[in-house]
C-alpha cells in the first residue's frame, strides 16, 4: 500500500541541535512506522521554537500522487521533509501519514561494500525489483563496464565513483526500499540533463507511479508532471495547487515572487 500525506497548520523551529539532526537525517534509512492506521500522511499547522523554518504549512497528497516542492535556498524544503520523517518536531499543527518512509538525500553517500549491497542495504533481495530499479536509475551501463558487475567493491579500498554514479546509486537505494512514502530531496543535482530526464521519467514517473512521492526540485519540467505543487518562501507556503493553477497566477506570480 502507499500512503496519503496530510499536513495541517504546521510550524517548526530549528533548535541548537540542528547539525546533529541534519546528520542523523542524512543517514536515516527511515524504517520508522506510524500507527495512524488510515494509510495517510497529514501535515497541519506546523512550527519550531526560535525563528520558524516552517510556518503554518498545509497540504494533502493522496496516495500514489507526486508532490513537487520548490522554493529558493533556505525556504524550508528540506525542513519539510525532516518534519515528515520525524527528525524535526512541529511546535504547532498536525502531520498525518502511515507506513514506511524512504528518503533520498541531496547528499549522496556510499558505504564500503558492493554496488548491490549499497542498493539492497539490508532489505531482502528481490531479483525482479532489483533489476527494475537498476534499469530505471540508469545504472545498467555503468555496471556492465565492470568485470565483477554489481559485485564490484565501493568505498574503502574499492573503486572511486563519479558524482553522478554516487547520486544514481543513492537514488536506487531509496527506490529499492519497499516504502509507502518516498521523500526525494533534490536527487538530480549531480546528474547531467539527459540522464536526469531519463531517470525522472523512467523512475519517478513510471516505476514509482503508484507510490506517494514528494520531490524537492527547482525544475519547471518536474512541476509540470507533478499532481500537486507546494512552493515555499521563507518557511511559508506561497502556493499550493496544480501546475495549471500556478500558470493562472501569472503575471502576479512573477511580480510577487521575484527577489
Amino acid at each position: 500500500t502507499t500512503t496519503e500525506v496530510v499536513m495541517e497548520n504546521v510550524t517548526a523551529f530549528w533548535e541548537e541541535g540542528f547539525g546533529e539532526l541534519f546528520e542523523k537525517a542524512k543517514q536515516n534509512n527511515n524504517n520508522r512506522k506510524t500507527s495512524n492506521g488510515d494509510d495517510s500522511l497529514f501535515f497541519s499547522n506546523f512550527s519550531l521554537l526560535g525563528t520558524p523554518v516552517l510556518k503554518d504549512i498545509n497540504f494533502k497528497i493522496e496516495r500514489g500522487q507526486l508532490l513537487a516542492v520548490a522554493g529558493s535556498t533556505g525556504a524550508g524544503k528540506t525542513s519539510l521533509l525532516m518534519v515528515i520523517m520525524g527528525e524535526l518536531e512541529p511546535s504547532e499543527g498536525k502531520i498525518k501519514h502511515s507506513g514506511r518512509i524512504s528518503f533520498c538525500s541531496q547528499f549522496s553517500w556510499i558505504m564500503p561494500g558492493t554496488i548491490k549491497e549499497n542498493i539492497i542495504f539490508g532489505v531482502s533481495y528481490d531479483e525482479y525489483r532489483y533489476r527494475s530499479v537498476i534499469k530505471a536509475c540508469q545504472l545498467e551501463e555503468d555496471i556492465s563496464k565492470f568485470a565483477e558487475k554489481d559485485n564490484i567493491v565501493l568505498g574503502e579500498g574499492g573503486i572511486t565513483l563519479s558524482g553522478g554514479q554516487r547520486a544514481r546509486i543513492s537514488l536506487a537505494r531509496a527506490v529499492y526500499k519497499d516504502a509507502d512514502l518516498y521523500l526525494l530531496d533534490s536527487p538530480f543535482g549531480y546528474l547531467d540533463v539527459l540522464t536526469e530526464k531519463e531517470i525522472f521519467e523512467s523512475c519517478v514517473c513510471k516505476l514509482m507511479a503508484n507510490k506517494t512521492r514528494i520531490l524537492v526540485t527547482s525544475k519547471m519540467e518536474h512541476l509540470k508532471k507533478a499532481d500537486k505543487i507546494l512552493i515555499l518562501h521563507e518557511g511559508s507556503s506561497y502556493f499550493y495547487g496544480t501546475f495549471s493553477e500556478l500558470q493562472n497566477l501569472q503575471p502576479d506570480f512573477s511580480s510577487k515572487l521575484m527577489g
Epitope: A70, G71, S72, T73, A75, G163, G189, Y190, D192, V193, S218, K219, M220, E221, L223, I231, H233, Y238, F253, S254, K256, L257, M258, G259
Partner: nanobody, 123 residues
Framework: QVQLQESGGGLVQAGGSLRLACAAT????????MGWYRQAPGKQRDMVAF???????DYADSVKGRFTISRDNARNTVYLRMNSLKPEDTATYYC?????????????????WGQGTQVTVSS
Amino acid sequence: QVQLQESGGGLVQAGGSLRLACAATGSIRNINTMGWYRQAPGKQRDMVAFITRAGNTDYADSVKGRFTISRDNARNTVYLRMNSLKPEDTATYYCHAEIAERSRPFYLTDDYWGQGTQVTVSS
C-alpha cells in the same frame, strides 16, 4: 529572452586541441548546471562533461583525462578544453544550461540549449 552561444569549434588534426566556449546571455537570475553534449551524424546526443554551480564535474568515460570543463559564474560562461583529439570526437557540440530567468520567481529553472558548434578531427 535567454540565449546560449557556442564558439571555438573547427577543423583540427588528430592529437590537436580546441577550446570551446559557451556564453549565456539575457535576463538571467541564476545558472545551476552547465554542460557540453555532442551528437555525431546518425547517433543520439550524449553527455561529454558537465559542471555544477559549485564546481563539481563529471565526464563521459571516453573523454576523461583529455577534456576539461570549467566555468566562469560571473560571466555566465562554460568552457571545454579538448586535448589529444581523436577522429571519433568529431561531432556537433552543444552547450546546455539550467537557468532561472529573472521573470521566474523562487529560482525555478528551465533547460536551455545552444545551436551547436561543429568539431571535426581529421586523421
